[in-house]
């Protein structure tokens, strides 16, 4: 029967007795930087070309027994997971292996850098189709390794890496922490995060998604027909590398940003038990398990968005946090979150010719996060309109006044330390969908975009008193671009998007008593692109 | 592995004096920084990636590496250039004493220097 991991990533329409999705990634080349491999294993024979690249440190220990089967174990298994005949994800993908890990599974940052450079030079000498680079390794945070990954990604290469097996924040490791790399955590057959003894999968905002990574059947280097089960975030990353190869084979022109957005979009949502993660990491960790798209074409009409969390600002009074979108994504909205509730909001601002989302800490606050909503919006022209604090009783407002521009997000930023001491407006005026409304002491920022066929609408859900969380979701066919809270009092910890749902978190004041003035409303801005939908219909 | 201690005898101990005459300080207003792995057990002191500024050409990378060797030799230190990077990042990989870091950080074109560290199969 089909192994659990292949079943998990396969949409129901392909599920038969066998895993046989269309086009197994035949147009794509996958580079594997790992241990040596057993290239004559039946599972990968003829599919993997062993390059002459080798840069590994000496093995440790005086009694080390170098046995080929042990030296090849990790790499052989991963090659099998990516493209193995029987147990592989992308059975049509061809692979090239570079040896950067020794027989003990240890390598160096410098060896990995030289390996990445080798790939870039190979790409320049002999340009082929789409390239995927699988990095099933991790070390401590490395500025230079992250920089090299960034350069390779900007040269059009898709890099996929293991989040790490340290039961820790993936942002503390490289290349997992490189924003341009697709970083993969590991889940098991029960959709639980993988535990590896005391350790386990890494987590946090630097993880893009999870994939099967426990008891994964694959090629064993013990013999040319042997199979073995292995576990780890390497195995999870190999699944995503295989899925990426399939997607790129079906749509070779996909950019890295488009591929990442599709991987997120087609993932299974909210299936991971978040209780496994440390409490402070749950909100930052994506609850996504990778899956193949239900059809290889026809996703183009979708307006794709993802949520990007910043690093924590730190607790100093003037501390700020910045969340950035990828180069070919548009920042459609910006929000902020603080566990203590002490924050001074957020604003969208230009930095290096691109909009970024900046959140501001407040005096006595433990720090803030900035949360960017990053979307794929071709031919978009977006700008930020700002209204200074109104000081008047009904609050501050700003709208999109340019012809053809629609509101995609609202942000508010204030200088006063505690908005809660200033009476907020009780109700938000209705009937003006292209308008952001906020506290009279706050400056309000509207993200206004013009793009072919773009239409947006505002959805709200309010409750009379804060009860921890208020949510509002966009309906089928619409994509959440903006998420904010009204009225933004000190009870509100912040707002953020989880998939297509806007979540507003607030302190539970049911125990301290509350008034109607402490009502909290979650405001979602939902958009769709008629232009993308029409274009995709014309293709079909 | 070609960076073993035994290879130090190959090292160049002195270079053309004109190399030494070139400016030793980085461009005005920029300070190169040093980075190392936060996890001490994974550090590999003695090997460093010297990363040069983005638009640095291969010839400049090679010249900077030679200059480091010359200046180190004048101070009685052996160094070995293990690899010159180009294609992704400009720079070079050097085996040298940590005592030379201050000197290396002052070389022209240097953006930052990172001590090598271990990575592991996951």
């Amino acid at each position: 029967s089909i192994p659990w991991n292949l079943e998990r990533i396969t949409p129901p329409r392909y599920r038969a007795d066998e895993y046989q999705p269309p086009d197994g990634g035949s147009l794509v080349e996958v580079y594997l930087l790992d241990t040596s491999i057993q290239s004559d294993h039946r599972e990968i024979e003829g599919r993997v070309m062993v390059t002459d690249f080798e840069n590994v440190p000496e093995e440790d220990g005086t009694r080390f027994h170098r046995q080929a089967s042990k030296c090849d174990s990790h790499g052989t298994h991963l090659a099998g997971v990516v493209s193995g005949r029987d147990a592989g994800v992308a059975k049509g993908a061809s692979m090239r292996s570079l040896r950067v890990l020794n027989c003990q599974g240890k390598g160096t940052v410098s060896g990995t850098l030289i390996g990445l450079e080798f790939i870039r030079k190979s790409q320049l000498v002999q340009p082929v189709g789409p390239l995927v680079v699988l990095l099933p390794l991790a070390g401590g945070y490395s500025r230079v390794l992250n920089a090299a990954c960034q350069r390779l990604a900007r040269a059009g290469v898709v890099l996929v890496t293991a989040a790490g097996n340290f039961r820790d924040d993936a942002c503390l490791y490289s290349p997992a922490s490189a924003p341009e790399v697709i970083t993969v955590g590991a889940t098991n057959a029960q959709d639980q995060p993988v535990t590896l003894g005391t350790l386990g999968t890494n987590f946090g905002r630097c993880v893009d998604l999870f994939a099967p990574g426990e008891d994964i059947i694959g090629a064993s280097s013990d013999c040319s027909t042997c199979f073995v089960s292995q576990s780890g975030t390497s195995q999870a990353a190999a699944h995503v590398a295989g899925i990426a190869a399939m997607m790129l084979s079906a749509e070779p022109e996909l950019t890295l940003a488009e591929l990442r957005q599709r991987l997120i979009h087609f993932s299974a949502k909210d299936v991971i038990n978040e209780a496994w993660f440390p409490e402070d990491q749950r909100v930052l960790t994506p609850n996504l398990v990778a899956a193949l798209p239900p059809s290889t074409h026809g996703a183009g009409w979708q307006l794709f968005c993802r949520t990007v969390w910043s690093a924590h600002s730190g607790p100093t009074r003037m501390a700020t946090a910045i969340a950035r979108c990828a180069p070919d994504e548009e920042l459609l909205s910006c929000s902020s979150f603080s566990r203590s509730g002490k924050r001074r909001g957020e604003r969208m601002e230009a930095q290096g010719g691109k909009l970024v989302c900046r959140a501001h800490n407040a005096f006595g606050g433990e720090g803030v996060y900035a949360i960017a909503r990053c979307c794929l919006l071709p031919q978009a022209n977006c700008s930020v309109h700002t209204a200074p604090p109104a000081e008047a009783s009904m609050g501050t407002r700003v709208h999109c006044h340019q012809q053809g521009h629609v509101l995609t997000g609202c942000s508010s930023h204030w200088e006063v330390e505690d908005l809660g001491t200033h009476k907020p407006p009780v109700l938000r005026p209705r009937g003006q969908p292209n308008q952001c409304v906020g506290h009279r002491e706050a400056s309000i920022h509207a993200s206004c975009c013009h793009a072919p066929g773009l239409e947006c609408k505002v959805k709200e859900h309010g409750i009379p008193a804060p009860q921890g969380q208020v949510t509002v979701a966009c309906e089928e066919g619409w994509t959440l671009t903006g998420c904010s809270a009204l009225p933004g009092t000190s009870h509100v910890l912040g707002a953020y998007a989880v998939d297509n749902t806007c979540v507003v978190r607030s302190r539970d004041v049911s125990t301290t008593g509350s008034t109607s003035e402490e009502a909290v409303t979650a405001v979602a801005i939902c958009c769709r692109s008629r232009h993308l939908a029409q274009a995709s219909q014309e293709l079909q | 592995q070609e960076d073993e201690d035994g290879d130090y005898e190959e090292l160049v101990l002195a270079l053309r004096s004109e190399e030494d005459g070139l400016a030793e300080a980085p461009e005005h207003g920029t300070t190169a920084t040093f980075h190392r792995c936060a996890k001490d057990p994974w550090r590999l002191p003695g090997t460093y990636v010297v990363v040069l500024k983005e638009e640095t050409h291969l010839s400049q990378s090679e010249r900077t590496a030679r200059r480091l060797q010359a200046q180190a030799a004048r101070r009685g230190y052996l160094t070995k250039i293990l690899h010159v990077f180009h294609g992704l990042l400009p720079g070079f990989l050097v085996k040298m004493s940590g005592d030379l870091l201050e000197l290396a950080l002052k070389l022209p074109h240097v953006d930052y220097i990172e001590e090598d560290s271990s990575v592991f199969a996951q």
Partner: antibody, heavy 122, light 111 residues
Framework: EVHLVESGGGVVQPGRSLRLSCAAS????????MHWVRQAPGKGLEWVAL????????YYADSVKGRFTISRDNSKNTLYLQMNSLRAEDTAVYYC???????????????WGQGTTVTVSS | ESVLTQPPSVSAAPGQKVTISCSGS????????VSWYQQLPGTAPKLLIY???KRPSGIPDRFSGSKSGTSATLGITGLQTGDEADYYC???????????FGTGTRVTVLG
């Protein structure tokens, strides 16, 4: 439930041999390094030996080097300690313990057996 | 003779805080991960802290670890009678190619 159960302890004369076993259950045995640690009566912990997950490398304390051999049978989920040329100072409770990390991090030991007593006496 | 030195004993009243030091060298604590183990009377040791300051699941946050240079410290706050035990630090020693334990510290809860 993760379990380690030691066996094979007993009273033995100096110069003789003994083989300890440790049966593992509840985890993927072949993914973890394994240690032997001992504790003499009224004394502290003393590390004895370590074997890698795949058996490819072994490390020993100086006090047992050349006399003790650590080994494992991954198909049987069992760890062994072959003790030859036993001495009175080898008298201790012997614990088997699992290495924290599947690979090469030397993080320490996270799961311990209850121990088996070895008494070396004439 | 152990290469890691700990105080033989520390004591404090319930609810108080105690710290246990572990002194080593650059070949062990200075450049390797430190773990702390608790051994209750008559039982096998139990892992409390690994990677200097990380707690396995199930270990309360009353236990904390830190490292500075070639020394490591275990802190126990809100001391309870159930914390009476021997505590050992441990780390790899790169020069010896061996794992080494500290001399051990007996914690006594007064009263």
């Amino acid at each position: 439930e993760v379990h380690l159960v030691e066996s094979g302890g007993g009273v033995v004369q100096p110069g003789r041999s003994l083989r300890l076993s440790c049966a593992a259950s509840g985890f993927t045995f072949n993914s973890f390094g394994m240690h032997w640690v001992r504790q003499a009566p009224g004394k502290g912990l003393e590390w004895v030996a370590l074997i890698w997950s795949d058996g490819s490398d072994e490390y020993y304390a100086d006090s047992v080097k050349g006399r003790f051999t650590i080994s494992r049978d991954n198909s049987k989920n069992t760890l062994y300690l072959q003790m030859n040329s036993l001495r009175a100072e080898d008298t201790a409770v012997y614990y088997c313990a699992r290495a924290i990390a599947a690979l090469y991090y030397y993080y320490g030991m996270d799961v311990w057996g209850q121990g088996t007593t070895v008494t070396v006496s004439s | 003779e152990s290469v890691l030195t700990q105080p033989p004993s520390v004591s404090a009243a319930p609810g108080q805080k105690v710290t246990i030091s572990c002194s080593g060298s650059s070949s062990n604590i200075g450049n390797n991960f430190v773990s702390w183990y608790q051994q209750l009377p008559g039982t096998a040791p139990k892992l409390l802290i690994y990677d200097y300051n990380k707690r396995p699941s199930g270990i309360p946050d009353r236990f904390s670890g830190s490292k500075s240079g070639t020394s490591a410290t275990l802190g126990i706050t809100g001391l309870q009678t159930g914390d009476e035990a021997d505590y050992y630090c441990g780390t790899w020693d790169s020069s010896l190619s061996a794992y080494v334990f500290g001399t051990g510290t007996r914690v006594t809860v007064l009263g």
